[in-house]
Interface confidence: low
């Protein structure tokens, strides 16, 4: 077990803070909830603290919760491939470019680390080149989320990982908005981290609303499990 993994044996409180600017529309989001890496489970509630969110909530899910991939459930035979937990408590910097097909792009930078007993994800997001009447600024996405696989590979030069995946957002007219994600994670501290073999995270997400919440918000439940690496031969012959 890595030193960082020991921090994730129980339920951990999570705080998410985002400052965003998309085509000049500035906004802030604050999120709170809990993560339980034993089950690969996240429950979070996000509130737009600046009024109405200028982009659809589903476009921010990867920035919020795929940001705290340290809560992914890594089966016993894959624990040596869990970069995310091994970087804790000092944490990691997570940078992404998200290309929305036939529309603009988000660039994000986040620091994910422990502050006391709380896992904090602080994010800056900049969005440019979006069409004012497109699927994103035109709020044409359905309020739901599909399952995805998130592909991870080691980046030995940077002592971190590279990640890429394609998100499928459902549009109200029945079509799909693709969002290509290119991600890089590097440790904040200088302690040893686990550099993984190629594998993927399997994600399931459900979006809902709090009937008692008057502010623009999103409630998120997510399960994330690592997969894609089989048991070694020594395991088979035990």
């Amino acid at each position: 077990m890595s030193k960082g993994e020991e921090l994730f044996t129980g339920v951990v409180p999570i705080l998410v803070e985002l400052d965003g600017d998309v085509n000049g529309h500035k906004f802030s989001v604050s999120g709170e909830g809990e993560g339980d890496a034993t089950y690969g489970k996240l429950t979070l509630k996000f509130i737009c603290t600046t009024g109405k969110l200028p982009v659809p909530w589903p476009t921010l899910v990867t920035t919020f919760s795929y940001g705290v991939q340290c809560f992914s459930r890594y089966p016993d035979h894959m624990k040596q491939h869990d970069f995310f937990k091994s970087a804790m408590p000092e944490g990691y910097v997570q940078e992404r470019t998200i290309f929305f097909k036939d529309d603009g792009n988000y660039k994000t930078r986040a620091e994910v680390k422990f502050e006391g007993d709380t896992l904090v994800n602080r994010i800056e997001l900049k969005g440019i080149d979006f069409k004012e009447d497109g699927n994103i600024l035109g709020h044409k996405l359905e309020y739901n989320y599909n399952s995805h696989n998130v592909y991870i590979m080691a980046d030995k030069q940077k002592n971190g990982i590279k990640v890429n995946f394609k998100i499928r957002h459902n549009i109200e007219d029945g079509s799909v908005q693709l969002a290509d994600h290119y991600q890089q994670n590097t440790p904040i501290g200088d302690g040893p981290v686990l550099l993984p073999d190629n594998h993927y995270l399997s994600t399931q997400s459900a979006l809902s609303k709090d009937p008692n919440e008057k502010r623009d918000h999103m409630v998120l439940l997510e399960f994330v499990t690592a997969a894609g690496i089989t048991h070694g031969m020594d395991e088979l012959y035990k």
Epitope: Y39, S147, S205, A206, L207, L221, F223
Partner: nanobody, 120 residues
Framework: ESGGGSVQAGGSLRLSCAAP????????MGWFRQAPGKEREEVAS????????YYADSVKGRFTMSQDNARSTVYLQMNSLKPEDTAMYYC??????????????????WGQGTQVTVSS
Amino acid sequence: ESGGGSVQAGGSLRLSCAAPRSTYTSNCMGWFRQAPGKEREEVASIYTGGDITYYADSVKGRFTMSQDNARSTVYLQMNSLKPEDTAMYYCAAGRGSWSCGSGPDEYKYWGQGTQVTVSS
């Protein structure tokens, strides 16, 4: 609950559980099992507000949980059954999404249970 019974190893069973609408909607429905002398174990659960599932490692790839929203009913399809699957199986309902995958303490409503016996 219904659908329990006796079966040979390698066989299949399908359990079903109907819940009151208010208990079912946007909550977590779970299947638990308890073998004699053992603790109650969460086998599978489904968040009815988003159709996402949790499975215990011991049943992954063999058991499938599904839901029928119109009937407020959940199902547990159990394939490739093993003798170690022998237990009393309980259906339970939690409050909201957090219950899924969080163990028995997070579940509020419980069924009477149905026995599943797998012989070799």
